[in-house]
């Protein structure tokens, strides 16, 4: 039985059929960030619910040690949410005194890390000012879309700033994958 | 004919093949929010178009009464934009006389209803603080991501200020899922 | 051989299998954009690198002329990001002097051309106000969405200020779009 | 074990400065949150100042807002509060607290305390 | 800011007895709540976190319920060592905040 009787009337020759619901998926949410030593001029990596409340991973999409594993060549559609909160940061206290500051940031980068390539390739960034002057201010990055990942690649959610990650709900910060 | 004559050489046993066009499948677009009761401490929920324009419905998800009904068990993808608008808040009137107060905040939350479990289930949420000073602001807040779902479930999208949803156009304001 | 062997037990006749690593994709990242006459009350497309570095396109998913060319009739995933960044507006040094301004904006559209339909489609909209006090802002807008379309449909993304937008990563700014 | 050792209290007159000091030991310290938190006599506890772990992010209660300053020197796992225009509400018992990750938890370890009194 | 309430301000008891400590918050902060306890010229100690984790080292007859603006702290069999001032604090949003503290004295 070959995979081409599927095709239509311009005879496409197709990969082999695959049932959708044995592909690699995980939906990862957000965890208390533990203490771990950070390097200088790297952002650091955020680590994840993996299996309670929303949080899952199936069909050999593993987590470990912060990293999705891609177990099987493919395309896959990669996204996650980041919610930060702070409080007034020191730009808007010195540009209320009439001097602009250059502002604050919050970015958000989804790695990927393949063994055998000395250098993580950064696949999605969400980066954005902050110039708040409010005593509370929160607000989410998304990022979202397709990659060709090859089995093995590693993936990764790293935040400018972990102090100011929201931790405290499940359905405002998360990170997810699933094969196309 | 057994669903593994597709699997590849590591012999995992698949599901049953599935054609992708019949999968459940909703787009729906904004339309103007019509007055309903609203809880106290409960976001409401806003109604939406499912025919017209971008809109749709497929392969028997149906939507009702402000409800995407999961028409068969599975993992999909849920994604809802909403576009807010409003004028100067209070937030920026305070500050602005040297006040700093606790932001006004815009919020939208996908939820789910599972009828034979009392609480809604909120799947996503993306919160912003809002205090801008420009006599008009407007700013979108995306949500997207993958949940496993069962058969009944049932997703709404509640938003905190029914009144500051921008609902003049079907592209600034929707809400979708897909069976994956 | 019928796709209705295939059906769950409620004997849904499904349309012809399909093997997944033979859709139409692709994912588009920035470039410099190169200078072109834009039409007044008309916004500007981006046009898109679509083979170097994480771009590509495959399966009959072709990128020409600031288009995706839509190669098959079906549901497609359509998603964009457009990080913008600016200096200080106008809106804010009037602000400052306590004369509210209609506020600047950022806005992305992700927009559908049928060849025999006169008039584009918005599909997508995202649209912010802009009312920034720090040096330098920047941020970006999301977009995705599942919508039906035709072969032959062609797909762009328009901004309102091509001369905002960041070019500079193609992890900032990229368009893309995948059949279900 | 976790220590936290504050020092560099006193008598101070109004509108004059002070600065304190907390050494940490037993811990990582360049990988948490430091707070501080003080106590009026026969009062309760109110917290003042926090700083990341990198030093990147200093927030304040807004009644020490423009007149304290938070800083860390993670080479020497030293958290510093540097106290201007002192008044006398700010008389006070000033302890340190280690935080957690992120800026915004809660203190699993305090200091013993210093006193700083603000006194014409 | 939210405000937290705590009562009673002071409640005598007797070595034994089961005690319970109320704090309210003003508005909803989840499960993101301290409890401390303090003893007269000391530091503050961390017993409860997240509402209802105990710390490590603190007796398990202390114990944390409540969520979303209603929370206890309850002492099962008051020893000793006990009597002290008990506040709690939010930490869901800034500034964190403590409540006025809880007494707990000899009967």
């Known amino acids: 039985l070959k995979g081409q009787e599927f095709a239509p009337s311009h005879q496409q020759v197709y990969a082999p059929l695959r049932a959708d619901g044995d592909k690699p998926r995980a939906h990862l949410t957000v965890v208390r960030q533990t203490p771990t030593q950070h390097f200088k001029n790297q952002f650091p990596a955020l680590h994840w619910e993996h299996e309670l409340g929303l949080a899952f991973t199936k069909n050999r999409m593993n987590y470990t040690n912060k990293f999705l594993l891609i177990p099987e060549s493919g395309d896959y559609f990669i996204y996650s949410q980041v919610t930060f909160r702070g409080m007034t940061s020191e730009c808007s206290e010195i540009r209320q005194a009439g001097r602009p500051n250059k502002p604050d940031s919050i970015t958000v980068v989804i790695t990927k890390v393949t063994d055998s390539y000395p250098e993580p390739t950064q696949l999605l960034m969400g980066t954005k000012s902050v110039c708040e002057v409010g005593s509370n201010w929160f607000q989410p990055i998304y990022l979202g879309a397709m990659f060709s990942l090859q089995e093995g690649d590693k993936l990764m959610v790293n935040v400018s700033d972990i102090s100011l990650v929201d931790y405290t709900k499940e359905d405002k910060t998360f990170f997810g994958a699933f094969l196309l | 004919l057994k669903g593994q004559e597709f699997a590849p050489s590591h012999q995992q046993v698949y599901a049953p093949l599935r054609a992708d066009g019949d999968k459940p499948r909703a787009h729906l677009t904004v339309v103007r929010q019509t007055p309903t009761q609203h809880f106290k401490n409960q976001f409401p929920a806003l109604h939406w178009e499912h025919e017209l324009g971008l809109a749709f419905t497929k392969n028997r998800m149906n939507y009702t009464n402000k409800f995407l009904l999961i028409p068969e068990s599975g993992d999909y993808f849920i994604y809802s934009q909403v576009t807010f608008r409003g004028m100067t808040s209070e937030c920026s009137e305070i500050r602005q006389a040297g006040r700093p107060n606790k932001p006004d905040s815009i919020t939208v939350v996908i939820t789910k209803v599972t009828d034979s479990y009392p609480e809604p289930t909120q799947l996503l949420m993306g919160t912003k603080s809002v205090c801008e000073v420009g006599s008009n602001w407007f700013q979108p807040i995306y949500l997207g991501a993958m949940f496993s779902l069962q058969e009944g479930d049932k997703l709404m999208v509640n938003v905190s200020d029914i009144s500051l949803v921008d609902y003049t156009k079907e592209d600034k304001t929707f809400f979708g899922a897909f069976l994956l | 051989l019928k796709g209705q062997e295939f059906a769950p037990s409620h004997q849904q006749v499904y349309a012809p299998l399909r093997a997944d690593g033979d859709k139409p994709r692709a994912h588009l990242t920035v470039v410099r954009q190169t200078p072109t006459q834009h039409f007044k009350n008309q916004f500007p497309a981006l046009h898109w690198e679509h083979e170097l570095g994480l771009a590509f396109t495959k399966n009959r998913m072709n990128y020409t002329n600031k288009f995706l060319l839509i190669p098959e009739s079906g549901d497609y995933f359509i998603y964009s990001q457009v990080t913008f960044r600016g200096m200080t507006s106008e809106c804010s040094e009037i602000r400052q002097a306590g004369r509210p301004n209609k506020p600047d904006s950022i806005t992305v559209v992700i927009t559908k051309v049928t060849d025999s339909y006169p008039e584009p489609t918005q599909l997508l909209m995202g649209t912010k106000s802009v009312c920034e006090v720090g040096s330098n802002w920047f941020q970006p807008i999301y977009l995705g969405a599942m919508f039906s379309l035709q072969e032959g449909d062609k797909l762009m993304v328009n901004v309102s200020d091509i001369s905002l937008v960041d070019y500079t990563k193609e992890d900032k700014t990229f368009f893309g779009a995948f059949l279900l | 074990q976790v220590q936290l050792v504050e020092s560099g209290g006193g008598v101070v007159q109004p509108g004059r400065s002070l600065r304190l000091s907390c050494a940490a030991s037993?811990?990582?310290?360049?990988?948490?949150?430091m707070h501080w938190v003080r106590q009026a006599p026969g009062k309760g506890l109110e917290w003042v100042a926090v700083?990341?772990?990198?030093?990147?992010?200093?927030y304040y209660a807004d009644s020490v807002k423009g007149r304290f300053t938070i800083s860390r020197d993670n080479s020497k796992n030293t958290l510093y509060l540097q106290m201007n225009s002192l008044r006398a509400e700010d008389t006070a018992v000033y302890y340190c607290?280690?935080?957690?990750?992120?800026?915004?938890?809660?203190?699993?370890?305090w200091g013993q305390g210093t006193l700083v009194t603000v006194s014409s | 800011d939210i405000q937290m309430t705590q009562s009673p301000s002071t409640l005598s008891a007797s070595v034994g007895d089961r005690v319970t400590i109320t704090c309210r918050a003003s508005?909803?902060?989840?499960?993101?709540l301290a409890w401390y306890q303090q003893k007269p010229g000391k530091a503050p100690k961390l017993l409860i976190y997240?509402?209802?984790s105990l710390e490590s080292g603190v007796p398990s007859r202390f114990s944390g319920s409540g969520s979303g603006t209603e929370f206890t702290l309850t002492i099962s069999s008051l020893q000793p060592d006990d009597f002290a001032t008990y506040y709690c604090?939010?930490?869901?949003?800034?500034?964190?905040?403590f409540g006025g503290g809880t007494k707990v004295e000899i009967k």
């Open positions: 997240d509402a209802s």
């Open positions: 037993g811990f990582t310290f360049s990988s948490y949150a």
């Open positions: 508005q909803s902060i989840s499960s993101w």
């Open positions: 604090q939010q930490y869901n949003s800034y500034p964190p905040t």
């Open positions: 700083i990341s772990y990198d030093g990147s992010n200093k």
């Open positions: 607290a280690r935080g957690q990750v992120a800026i915004l938890d809660y203190f699993d370890y």
